[in-house]
Interface confidence: low
């Protein structure tokens, strides 16, 4: 089941998935001046069996001016600098993600891909948040969000993270304004069953990653 919405936006923060659940789609988009090759894939799809998950299809871009270039190579460092993504969609592998069954790793970049990756997440996906440079985190709980199915609808849990500027000294964790949860009430008050299949294993994995999640994003 695809999640209907994007993960929540937190001011001055970015989010990143450490691994992608089977069923996740990644659009094959090309940067300006390039296009998908004719008969090229529309998207990559995370698929797998009980022991191994991988991305089906490959994204390939070619110059809009030419018709025969179909090469697909990892960009050189100077090309990588063009990827000014706002959501840190970069191939980061801080831990061995083979330990998370039913998930795919971040796909490697393809030549001339668009500057931002758009994923279509599925229920059960977890993403992690970090404050952008120049802001520091005030935690009131996990800085993560999970796409859950509730009452037949998908929703993302609210990450408990506030990012404050380094110079701001007036706000302390005890002074934070409470943030409303998506349905306007605390999540503990929701009255229907929420499926939590593999959230626990992801949370445990997150704990081991805390210091290294966001260390290799493109500059």
């Amino acid at each position: 089941e695809l999640c209907d919405d994007d993960p929540p936006e937190i001011p001055h923060a970015t989010f990143k998935a450490m691994a992608y659940k089977e069923g996740t789609m990644l659009n094959c988009e090309c940067k300006r001046g390039f296009r998908r090759i004719k008969s090229g894939s529309l998207y990559m799809l995370c698929t797998g069996n009980s022991s191994h998950s991988s991305w089906d299809n490959q994204c390939q871009c070619t110059s809009s001016a030419t018709r025969n270039t179909t090469k697909q190579v990892t960009p050189q460092p100077e090309e990588q600098k063009e990827r000014k993504t706002t959501e840190m969609q970069s191939p980061m592998q801080p831990v061995d993600q083979a330990s998370l069954p039913g998930h795919c790793r971040e796909p490697p970049p393809w030549e001339n891909e668009a500057t931002e990756r758009i994923y279509h997440f599925v229920v059960g996906q977890m993403v992690y948040y970090q404050c952008v440079q120049g802001y520091r985190a005030l935690h009131r709980g996990p800085a993560e969000s999970v796409c859950k199915m509730t009452h037949g609808k998908t929703r993302w849990t609210q990450p408990q993270l506030i990012c404050t500027g380094e110079m701001e000294t007036s706000q302390f964790p005890g002074e934070e304004k409470p943030q409303a949860s998506p349905e306007g009430r605390p999540e503990s008050e929701t009255s229907c069953l929420v499926t939590t299949t593999d959230f626990q294993i992801q949370t445990e994995m997150a704990a081991t990653m805390e210091t290294s999640i966001f260390t290799t994003e493109y500059q």
Epitope: N27, C28, E29, C30, K38, L42, Y43
Partner: nanobody, 127 residues
């Protein structure tokens, strides 16, 4: 579910301009590609223009290229179609469409590729 509501249609003289707007609500707007289609009286629905989620990719039908401009405002969940130098043959009901399929600049999108549609807004160009 995504809901789309068009506005801005009306009666205009040939050579005039109109700006159509499409307001999207529900579901994910930012990750969806958006398009405009039109249906003239007695004709099939035809592609007019489309814009990708990243605004990196804009496509136009040959008949409107250079006259129409598609744009989007992801912050406001809006898509626009600026129509200049209108001709009587531009008379039609204009529909806003959305989906999360990537756009391909080597293929003109078809109506079947888009899963979400507005009710349409009528544009009449008099000579």
């Amino acid at each position: 579910q995504v809901q789309l509501v068009e506005s801005g249609g009306g009666l205009v003289q040939a050579g005039g301009s109109l700006r159509l707007s499409c307001a999207a609500s529900g579901g994910t707007f930012r990750t969806r590609n958006m398009g405009w289609f039109r249906r003239a009286p007695g004709k099939e629905r035809e592609f007019v223009a489309a814009v990708s989620w990243s605004v990196d990719n804009k496509l136009y039908a040959g008949s409107v290229k250079g006259r129409f401009t598609i744009s989007r405002d992801n912050g406001r969940n809006m898509v626009y179609l600026q129509m200049n130098s209108l001709k009587p043959e531009d008379t039609a009901v204009y529909y806003c469409a959305a989906d999360n399929i990537p756009l391909s600049s080597d293929m003109r999108p078809t109506a079947t590729e888009f899963g979400y549609w507005g009710q349409g807004t009528r544009v009449t160009v008099s000579s």
